[in-house]
């Protein structure tokens, strides 16, 4: 995976964040797979710091070694720091685990920014605030890395929750979630509620804050309002979906829908931003600029390079438009839309120089690898990764940040014809020739 500002990402911080909550509505969905209702032991099991990723506590080995692991739906390896590193307070010590098995194989994973390599093995893994099971899973023990771990992020590894097709070094390396489902009676479904802060947090608040929930094996109804709408997983590699229409404040971008999915559209908790293909990004920014023209912002702001600040509590949310993505529905010629607020796509950052101000970065950015629905999107919604039924569900998150005038929304159905034509078919090419140099 790992594209652009890809990993690690913006974390969910305050839980519950400030702002109004929506009342629960009746759930219109018929039987969902997995256990229904309350997964109280898994609620609030994610933490993080703004821009640095949502992580869950996991244990590895015998006796158990506790590590914080970044939750990443945009990759498929379970990989943990396994050697001293200046940014790691702790790491997996294979020699201390009586259940570690060496696979005698190395793995190298380069991202657009940053890379790591490690040695493959298997060990016993469990999630203390997850299902009460222990599974033997593949683990990449990270022995060398560059621009991967983040100083002060508080996580020591990454849990890739996508499919085997994109696992490194190849698709024969079974991902963690596949092992979990195979070795237990846990249903093949998980769901994520990422709770963005909505305001900058100082270090103390950030470390103490709850960032959200990863529900393994089902859906927790306390985490969303309204109903769940599902979009098909187009192909099981990344969590690939099809966007059929994009609107800014209700105004259609009017592009060929293939452009929205060029060369793919994925749901990726390991990416901070909403990332859009070049043409789409340019059209979207033009439209957002026009809608918010009562204030002028520097070009660097729209490029995600410069902060904009307002006096504490005076952020003019109302001048910024909502962004709606229409996703292919489960029924032929039917779509639904998810709508995010500026509270999602303006990312709060702490600016030491102006700590009395509220400062933000524009968290929509350009991509050369398709649309990436990162934390900016996911923080508005409860997202259900229903692998059993090859679909992804969206509902309004009970913890999303909003104001008294607007909330994030999931609405439908809408009639949309020829949605299949919106998918881009990637040409099959030979492996890329990445040349580096060897020991």
């Amino acid at each position: 995976t790992h594209l652009g500002i890809r990993l690690p990402l913006r974390s969910g911080l305050a839980g519950p964040p400030l702002g109004l909550r929506l009342p629960r509505e009746t759930d219109e969905e018929s039987e969902e797979p997995g256990r229904r209702g309350s997964f109280v032991e898994m609620v609030d099991n994610l933490r993080g710091k703004s821009g640095q990723g949502y992580y869950v506590e996991m244990t590895v080995g015998s006796p158990p070694q506790t590590l914080n692991i970044l939750v990443d739906t945009g990759s498929s390896n379970f990989a943990v720091g396994a050697a001293p590193h200046p940014f790691l307070h702790r790491y997996y010590q294979r020699q201390l685990s009586s259940t570690y098995r060496d696979l005698r194989k190395g793995v190298y994973v380069p991202y657009t920014q940053g890379k790591w390599e490690g040695e493959l093995g298997t060990d016993l893994v469990s999630i203390p605030h997850g299902p009460n099971v222990t599974v033997r899973a593949n683990i990449a023990a990270i022995t060398e890395s560059d621009k991967f771990f983040i100083n002060g992020s508080n996580w020591e590894g990454i849990l890739g929750l996508a499919y085997a097709e994109i696992a490194r070094p190849d698709d024969s390396l079974e991902p963690f979630f596949d092992s979990l489902v195979k070795q237990t009676h846990i249903p093949n479904i998980f769901s994520l509620q990422l709770c963005g802060a909505g305001f900058p947090l100082n270090q103390t608040e950030a470390l103490a804050s709850v960032g959200g929930s990863m529900i393994i094996g089902g859906i927790d109804h306390s985490l969303y309002t309204g109903r769940l709408w599902y979009t098909p997983i187009r192909r099981e590699w990344y969590y690939e979906v099809i966007i059929v229409r994009v609107e800014i404040n209700g105004q259609d971008l009017k592009m060929d829908c293939k452009e929205y999915n060029y060369d793919k559209s994925i749901v990726d908790s390991g990416t901070t931003n909403l990332r859009l293909p070049k043409k789409v990004f340019e059209a979207a920014v033009k439209s957002i600029k026009a809608a918010s023209s009562t204030e002028k912002f520097p070009d660097g702001f729209w490029l995600g390079e410069q902060l904009v600040c307002w006096q504490a509590g005076t952020t003019p949310w109302n001048i910024f438009p909502v962004i709606s993505l229409y996703l292919m529905g489960e029924v032929t010629n039917q779509s639904f839309r998810i709508t995010i607020l500026p509270q999602q796509y303006l990312r709060p950052v702490e600016d030491v120089a102006t700590s009395q101000d509220d400062c933000y970065k524009f968290a929509v950015s350009q991509s050369s690898t398709g649309t990436v629905m990162g934390a900016v999107i996911m923080e508005g919604f409860y997202v259900v990764f229903d692998r059993a039924r090859k679909r992804i569900g969206f509902a309004v998150s009970a913890c999303h940040v909003h104001d008294e005038f607007r909330t994030a929304a999931v609405e439908g159905p809408f009639v949309t014809a020829d949605m299949e034509d919106c998918g881009y078919n990637i040409p099959q090419t030979d492996e890329s020739t990445l040349m580096t140099g060897r020991a």
Epitope: E117, D146, T433, L434, M435, G437, A439
Partner: antibody, heavy 124, light 108 residues
Framework: EVQLLESGGGLVQPGGSLRLSCAAS????????MSWVRQAPGKGLEWVSA????????YYADSVKGRFTISRDNSKNTLYLQMNSLRAEDTAVYYC?????????????????WGQGTLVTVSS | DIQMTQSPSSLSASVGDRVTITCRAS??????LNWYQQKPGKAPKLLIY???SLQSGVPSRFSGSGSGTDFTLTISSLQPEDFATYYC??????????FGGGTKVEIK
């Protein structure tokens, strides 16, 4: 100019031990993976062991696994090969070679440059 | 592990001749193949990396081609200093890495 200079070779009895060193200069040593490659008299090249830039990753040929240990001291710009339980078939010229990056498992790599080699003879 | 097979194991040629050495991998290695030259009593020297990229300082009479499993090293006009042994090696897989058996180029 990048230079690699091996030392520590010599005559040793079967079952004995030797420690080879490779002193590096002319480049940022810690930024590059390093390897040991050997060549038995009149034979071809055989890769022996490699270590990543920080020393976190190491790997060995099956023929030496459990007997040889590769290590590095980045503060001294020196690569080592500790050879224990030596056998007659370990007799060879041992070369150290620089990789093109810090990575051990990255595809598309090569050995360049190589040291001049040090001869290890295992004989009773 | 991937096996590398070089042919011929030796060849005799004259100065000015065009010489071709082949290397075959036991499975596809894309373009991840390197060629080295070794003269008697000396350390090997990198000639070509990534199947066809000439290492800095190597004369242009050396060239490499191929991808997948079959690769070729060509010396367009053999010079006296080119009499040596040539080795290929793959860098597609993670270690352990293997070299070809070598091709000795001798004076006819």
């Amino acid at each position: 100019e990048v230079q690699l200079l091996e030392s520590g070779g010599g005559l040793v009895q079967p079952g004995g031990s030797l420690r080879l060193s490779c002193a590096a200069s002319g480049f940022t040593f810690s930024s590059y993976a390093m390897s040991w490659v050997r060549q038995a008299p009149g034979k071809g090249l055989e890769w022996v062991s490699a270590i990543s830039g920080s020393g976190g990753s190491t790997y060995y040929a099956d023929s030496v696994k459990g007997r040889f240990t590769i290590s590095r001291d980045n503060s001294k710009n020196t690569l080592y090969l500790q050879m224990n339980s030596l056998r007659a078939e370990d007799t060879a010229v041992y070369y150290c070679a620089k990789g093109g990056s810090q990575w051990l498992y990255a595809p598309g790599s090569w050995f360049d440059p190589w040291g001049q080699g040090t001869l290890v003879t295992v004989s009773s | 592990d991937i096996q590398m097979t070089q042919s011929p194991s030796s060849l005799s040629a004259s100065v000015g001749d065009r010489v071709t050495i082949t290397c075959r991998a036991s499975q596809s290695i894309s373009s991840y193949l390197n060629w080295y030259q070794q003269k008697p009593g000396k350390a090997p020297k990198l000639l070509i990396y990534a199947a066809s990229s000439l290492q800095s300082g190597v004369p242009s009479r050396f060239s490499g081609s191929g991808s997948g499993t079959d690769f070729t090293l060509t010396i367009s006009s053999l010079q006296p200093e080119d009499f040596a042994t040539y080795y290929c090696d793959e860098s597609y897989s993670t270690p352990p890495w293997t070299f070809g058996g070598g091709t000795k180029v001798e004076i006819k």
